[in-house]
């Protein structure tokens, strides 16, 4: 039902849902610190623009008694319970920053009259695509899917001369929230990825994956999985791998590959790693100390959510426009704003755009090297290393189907 918003007369409030069930197991204190750091910046920016207004955040905690699994499985009801709490207290802000779980975001969007914007650090699933008042500040599954299709079709690079049309997808059900939805999107029979591929099989057992590595009758040389190098090692170990196998390891929120002293272990030589362009360093931040790379990105998304709200508030106030209107609720898209770590671009549907980076292991240096980058905003691939020192024959990626000649 409609809830009056604390969002007028020079006082603007942000409702931050602090949910026990979260896309990443991040202490809520760290997220609070991120929000507070963002608020300080927003206040400074508004003051600098000559706008003498108050901006605050209200942190809404769930009781944690019922919804305490800690992951996203019981998040659907937790999100709705928090909304009910807001409704009962008549304490809705101008914007809702919160649910990171796809389940909760989808249900909250469905079950409320959303006349206010919703900003999420997460909500990776396809079911949260194309939502008119939802903004997502971490790369959603749709963006990954578009990269993969683009890369599969590419056949005019010195190191990739074959179009691919097949793939195995390894998905065993123990994935993190981001990986779960990324792989879910690839698995879905109605998704763009499935539509564009001629053959795709999901491997659900460790043994299935392990058998494919040397199976002469395999239907594809390409296997997509999601996680870090350790996850791959647990699964693959030091098993022999056929020379034309290519493993695509999706590990978007991990910038450790770019650290100077990192050496790629031997088991990564058949692997291309897909990650995000580094830079989320948060070097001087009070909230970023002791955070893992993934959690840095999560906390950064909360901080950037605050900065995004400040950006939109500033624009609307400067134009003398009302904040509690559908126009404001629908405005958080198709724009670039100054984020904490640099410019942040949102697409027409309010989803963050980014530069994805595909890395390979150099057989010469045992270092991760950039093979190509992909700009999600323009859906375009940019080759970086035109003569990579691959493990694959002739320093070229193999065909996706063994024995099939040039196409």
């Amino acid at each position: 039902s409609q809830v009056s918003q604390n969002c007028h007369n020079g006082s603007y409030e942000i409702s931050v849902l602090m949910m026990g069930n979260s896309a990443f197991a991040e202490p809520l204190k760290n997220l609070e610190d991120a929000v507070n750091e963002g608020l300080e910046i927003v206040r400074g920016r508004l003051q600098n623009a000559g706008l003498n207004v108050t901006v605050n955040a209200t942190f809404m905690y769930s009781d944690g008694l019922i919804h305490n699994s800690g992951d996203c499985r019981s998040s659907t009801c937790e999100g709705l319970d928090l909304l009910r709490k807001i409704s009962n207290a008549q304490r809705m802000g101008c914007v809702l920053i919160g649910p990171s779980c796809t389940y909760s975001t989808f249900q909250m969007y469905l079950d409320t009259e959303l006349s206010y914007p919703m900003i999420s650090a997460g909500s990776f699933g396809l079911s949260c695509d194309y939502k008119e008042t939802l903004t997502r500040l971490m790369s959603p599954a749709r963006k990954l899917m578009y990269f993969l299709v683009n890369f599969w079709k590419t056949n005019d690079l010195p190191f990739k001369t074959y179009s691919w049309s097949t793939s195995y997808v390894y998905k065993n059900g123990t994935e993190t929230e981001d990986c779960f939805w990324y792989l879910n999107a690839l698995e879905a029979s109605v998704s763009y990825f499935s539509h564009e591929l001629g053959f795709k099989v999901v491997l659900r057992q460790d043994k299935e994956f392990q058998d494919i590595l040397m199976d002469h009758n395999r239907k594809s040389n390409v296997i997509i999985m999601c996680g870090g190098p350790e996850f791959l090692y647990k699964l693959k170990g030091d098993r022999a791998v056929a020379e034309d196998i290519v493993i695509i390891l999706v590990d978007l929120f991990n910038d450790q590959y770019f650290e100077d002293n990192v050496t790629a272990p031997d088991y990564m030589k058949n692997v291309l790693v897909l990650t995000l362009s580094p830079g989320n360093s948060l070097l001087n931040s009070s909230f970023s100390r002791n955070l893992s790379p993934t959690k840095r990105d999560f906390a950064l998304a909360y901080l950037n959510g605050i900065l995004l709200f400040g950006h939109m508030l500033k624009i609307f106030l400067e134009n003398g426009e009302n904040i509690t209107t559908p126009k404001f609720a629908h405005a958080f898209r198709n724009l670039t704003f100054e984020g904490y770590d640099g410019p942040v671009t949102l697409d027409d549907w309010g989803d963050v755009d980014s530069t994805m980076v595909l890395l390979y292991t150099s057989v010469d240096t045992k270092k991760y090297k950039v093979l190509l980058t992909y700009d999600t905003h323009v859906n375009k691939t940019y080759p970086v290393d035109m003569s990579p020192t691959f493990t694959w024959k002739n320093s070229k990626l193999p065909n996706d189907i063994t024995g099939r000649g040039p196409q």
């Epitope: 948060l282 070097l283 770590d341």
Partner: nanobody
């Protein structure tokens, strides 16, 4: 009104070093990123280095490995340490801070400081 003041320019021999400073009376460096630009005679103004709120830095290819941008929030100052200077680094150096405008530059400029690299 935000004012930016550059200092530290001068004449230096090739291979030498200089440290430029950009100071503001406001808290602009705490709320926005900041860029150093330069403009050589008869040439377009070009970006040299950027420092974002997070402390992340980026550099143009021409100065990568030689120049370092840094910030001291307590002093409301951003620095550009320039090492191994070359004659082609000769230019007027400007600091640019604040919100990015439609033209992709930030809204506030300093008056510039001249750097001349010559033997």
């Amino acid at each position: 009104e935000v004012q930016l003041v550059e200092s530290g320019g001068g004449l230096v021999q090739p291979g030498g070093s200089l440290r430029l400073s950009c100071t503001s009376s406001s808290n602009i460096f705490k709320i926005y990123g900041m860029d150093w630009y330069r403009q050589a005679p008869g040439k377009q103004r070009e970006i040299v280095a950027t420092i974002y709120l997070s402390g992340r830095t980026t550099y143009s290819d021409a100065v990568k490995g030689r120049f370092t941008i840094s910030r001291d929030n307590a002093k409301n100052t951003v620095y550009l340490q320039m090492n191994t200077l070359k004659p082609e680094d000769t230019a007027v150096y400007y600091c640019n801070a604040g919100e990015t405008t439609a033209s992709s530059v930030r809204q506030y400029w300093g008056q510039g400081t001249q750097v001349t690299v010559s033997s």
